[in-house]
């Protein structure tokens, strides 16, 4: 199904405009900002979501140490260029002709340049580390319960195949979720780890992208998991190219 037929809405993306103008009067939904048709049975790509967001009115287990090549999205929001399939274009430019290269999750991976900057290919982000700190609780969460509930969340809410959730680490109060997905592993129809991570990030911040009540209520054995801080690290298949000046700053 492409959308909820009864009231013609998109269950997986509230930032859409839907109308029964599809083939045979079927409900069809288009992303705000780009006007691209979206498949409401799965997650919408992060590129289209960012574009929609910019167009909307303003309102003994050890934790993983991110590698030296891990990227953090420090640049924040921008209005991206998306390709016809909704993916980020390798080169992004702003209105003042400043350009940079991005990875498959839209995070800058080079220094900024001018219109002459070349980005030969869209480099895939194959490893995402989601680092969370939860609010103090009476006791630590049981690690296996936490692991099971987070895996269930990614499988059922974000429709991410379980094989792409590589690990869930826990050292109270820090939780780390590792997502891994190489180009060769991702089959047609598979949800991209970058899209799943973005939906999760928005959910955790109380800005759910799903149609409906607008909040994520994540519980481990009945106790709400309240996240105080979120950091997301992105690792690309090819290391990023930044000047030494940035690396020493």
């Amino acid at each position: 199904h492409t959308a909820a037929q009864d009231n013609c809405t998109c269950p997986t993306n509230k930032m859409t405009v839907c109308s029964p103008d599809g083939p045979g009067g079927r409900c069809q939904c288009r992303a705000l900002g780009s006007g691209m048709a979206v498949d409401c049975s799965t997650l919408t790509s992060k590129c289209l979501l960012l574009k929609a967001r910019m167009s909307a009115p303003k309102n003994a287990r050890t934790l993983v140490r991110p590698s030296e090549h891990a990227l953090v999205d420090n640049d924040g929001l921008y209005d991206p260029d998306c390709d016809p399939e909704g993916r980020f274009k390798a080169r992004q430019c702003n209105q003042t002709s400043v350009c940079w290269c991005v990875n498959s999750v839209g995070v800058r991976r080079t220094d900024k340049g001018d219109l002459s900057l070349r980005c030969d290919e869209l480099v895939r982000t194959h490893h995402i580390l989601i680092d969370l700190r939860h609010r103090p609780t009476a006791g630590a969460f049981n690690h296996s319960d936490l692991d099971a509930e987070l895996r269930r969340l990614f499988r059922e809410r974000y429709r991410l195949h379980p094989k792409f959730v590589a690990a869930v680490h826990y050292e109270q109060p820090t939780i780390q979720i590792e997502l891994r997905q190489n180009t060769s592993q991702k089959a047609a129809g598979d949800v991209d780890i970058g899209d799943a991570a973005y939906y999760f990030e928005r959910d955790i911040k109380g800005e759910s992208l799903f149609q409906g009540r607008g909040g994520l209520d994540l519980r481990v054995r009945g106790e709400p998991l309240q996240v105080e801080r979120t950091l997301i690290y992105y690792l690309d298949e090819i290391p990023p190219k930044f000047s030494m000046k940035r690396l020493t700053a």
Partner: antibody, heavy 118, light 112 residues
Framework: QVQLKQSGPGLVAPSQSLSITCTVS????????VNWIRQPPGKGLEWLGV???????NYNSALMSRLSISKDNSKSQVFLKMNSLQTDDTGMYYC?????????????WGQGTLVTVS | DIQMTQSPSSLAVSAGEKVTMSCKSS????????????LAWYQQKPGQSPKLLIS???SRESGVPDRFTGSGSGTDFTLTISSVQAEDLAVYYC????????FGGGTKLELK
């Protein structure tokens, strides 16, 4: 569509146990939790306990020693068992589904089972 | 355990009147991360199962008339009916889900 149908005896003798079954359709018990709530005649609602999607349970602390909730995912059934009933356990007993990650709200309720302890 | 206190316990109104009822919790129901409150409002008409009206303290459920408004944060919450209709006569319950679940004692809405 989502439905919860309850079945169980209407009359229970004092000191005996109560067993009610909630049979669900339109959703899977591996994806949604099911709660039990009761309401004495002319009184308010009292939460009894919950069977979470993952199989764990939580109970009202005041009633924990007398309550047991279990489920059979393959049969789409959740079971409430309550021991040592007294006359003040008389009332309507409901099962209700929570909304999974959209919030522990009870958006779908069973029709209720009237239990009389006499 | 979190206690929920509703007031008044009953309320006699005329059709068209504006009505407000209060719900107070013994501790804050606010999730500071998502800025959402774990509070819901239910409506129960005689002989019927309760019906969910409001979730997250202020999110109206699909199909609920817009004369119903939930507000408040932390420990103090309010349900307002802007213009009471005959079909609104019922008992209204608040419920916390911050730490398992507790219902308030209810507010009964009656016709004057």
């Amino acid at each position: 569509q989502v439905q919860l149908k309850q079945s169980g005896p209407g009359l229970v003798a004092p000191s005996q146990s109560l067993s009610i079954t909630c049979t669900v359709s339109g959703f899977s018990l591996t994806s949604y939790g099911v709660n039990w709530i009761r309401q004495p005649p002319g009184k308010g609602l009292e939460w009894l306990g919950v069977m979470w999607a993952g199989g764990s349970t939580n109970y009202n602390s005041a009633l924990m020693s007398r309550l047991s909730i279990s489920k059979d995912n393959s049969k789409s059934q959740v079971f409430l068992k309550m021991n040592s009933l007294q006359t003040d356990d008389t009332g309507m007993y409901y099962c209700a589904r929570d909304e999974n990650w959209d919030g522990a709200w009870f958006a779908y309720w069973g029709q209720g089972t009237l239990v009389t302890v006499s | 355990d979190i206690q929920m206190t509703q007031s008044p316990s009953s309320l006699a109104v005329s059709a068209g009147e504006k009505v407000t009822m209060s719900c107070k919790s013994s501790q804050s129901l606010l999730n500071s991360g998502t800025r959402k409150n774990y509070l819901a409002w239910y409506q129960q008409k005689p002989g019927q199962s309760p019906k969910l009206l409001i979730s997250w303290a202020s999110s109206r459920e699909s199909g609920v008339p817009d004369r119903f408004t939930g507000s408040g944060s932390g420990t103090d919450f309010t349900l307002t009916i802007s213009s009471v209709q005959a079909e609104d006569l019922a008992v209204y319950y608040c419920k916390q889900s911050y730490n398992l679940f507790t219902f308030g004692g209810g507010t009964k809405l009656e016709l004057k």
